[in-house]
């Protein structure tokens, strides 16, 4: 025997009180698939939480987050603070990143500027709380000969003569 | 059904308090961490401050020393001491609960309040 809820369509439900005839589902619910003894709430974004998508009565609502914060975990199940670049999330709110870390997103974590010397290399161009550390060639590639390529004369102030 | 209910908004000049209250209904408040956020004219939403259980606080730098958020679980209230107000402290006021127990994040579970408006201003 063929159970008759399973001709109750998406955006109905199968209702036992009513000798299992397919009711449409009330406001502010919805059913995503045939067959279904009951309809499912539809999702509210409150707060921080702002609607992407409205419910209907076949699919749930979406949510996004409200400018200033971002979405994290499935679906954007949480709404997380941005802060600025330089900056992160901590415990007592935003927060700049410690001298040697940067961030260069509006999220996420301070990450320690690269090591340039771990690779050999020299720095290039200094790090700050926002931008990593650029590492240049290695000080064997700036020795005469080393390579093809000439790196830029050093600028030096009128009358100095070089070291 | 879960209620949160705001009060005590309203106009007071720069270098005055006021006291916020959200009144809280339909769920086991006492062991509920508690959060407020404010949203300026125009502006983003901010996280201003939260609050445990057990009572331990959190607030955004740029409040700190002139709020004061503070719990009564006989009272199922959660209230936002505000003095040394100043101009850029006017926002709609909301009151949330806090189930990350993570400063700057909600949960799509979190219950949210309908706000207060406090405007600074001479």
């Known amino acids: 025997l063929q159970d008759p809820c399973s001709n109750c369509p998406a955006g109905t439900f199968c209702d036992n009180n009513r000798n299992q005839i397919c009711s449409p589902c009330p406001p502010n619910s919805f059913s995503s698939a045939g067959g279904q003894r009951t309809c499912d709430i539809c999702r509210q974004c409150k707060g921080v939480f702002r609607t992407r998508k409205e419910c209907s009565s076949t699919s749930n609502a979406e949510c996004d987050c409200t400018p200033g914060f971002h979405c994290l975990g499935a679906g954007c199940s949480m709404c997380e603070q941005d802060c600025k670049q330089g900056q992160e999330l901590t415990k007592k709110g935003c927060k700049d990143c410690c001298f040697g870390t940067f961030n260069d997103q509006k999220r996420g974590i301070c990450r320690p500027w690269t090591n340039c010397s771990l690779d050999g290399k020299s720095v290039l161009v200094n790090g700050t709380k926002e931008r990593d550390v650029v590492c240049g060639p290695s000080p064997a590639d700036l020795s005469p000969g080393a390579s093809s390529v000439t790196p830029p004369a050093p600028a030096r102030e009128p009358g100095h003569s070089p070291q | 059904e879960v209620d949160l209910v705001e009060s005590g908004g309203g106009l007071v000049q720069p270098g005055g308090s006021l006291r916020l209250s959200c009144a809280v209904s339909?769920?086991?408040?006492?062991?509920?961490?508690m959060s407020w956020a404010r949203q300026a004219p125009g502006k983003e939403f901010e996280w201003v401050s939260s609050?445990?259980?057990?009572?331990?606080?959190y607030y955004v730098e740029s409040v700190k020393g002139r709020f004061t958020i503070s719990r009564d679980n006989a009272k199922n209230t959660v209230y936002l001491q505000m003095s040394s107000l100043r101009p850029e402290d006017t926002a709609v006021y909301y009151c949330?609960?806090?189930?990350?127990?993570?400063?700057?994040?909600?949960?799509?579970?979190?219950?949210w309040g309908q706000g207060t408006l406090v405007t600074v201003s001479s």
């Open positions: 609050i445990y259980s057990s009572g331990k606080t």
């Open positions: 949330a609960t806090w189930k990350t127990l993570r400063v700057g994040v909600w949960d799509e579970s979190d219950y």
């Open positions: 339909g769920f086991t408040f006492s062991s509920s961490a």
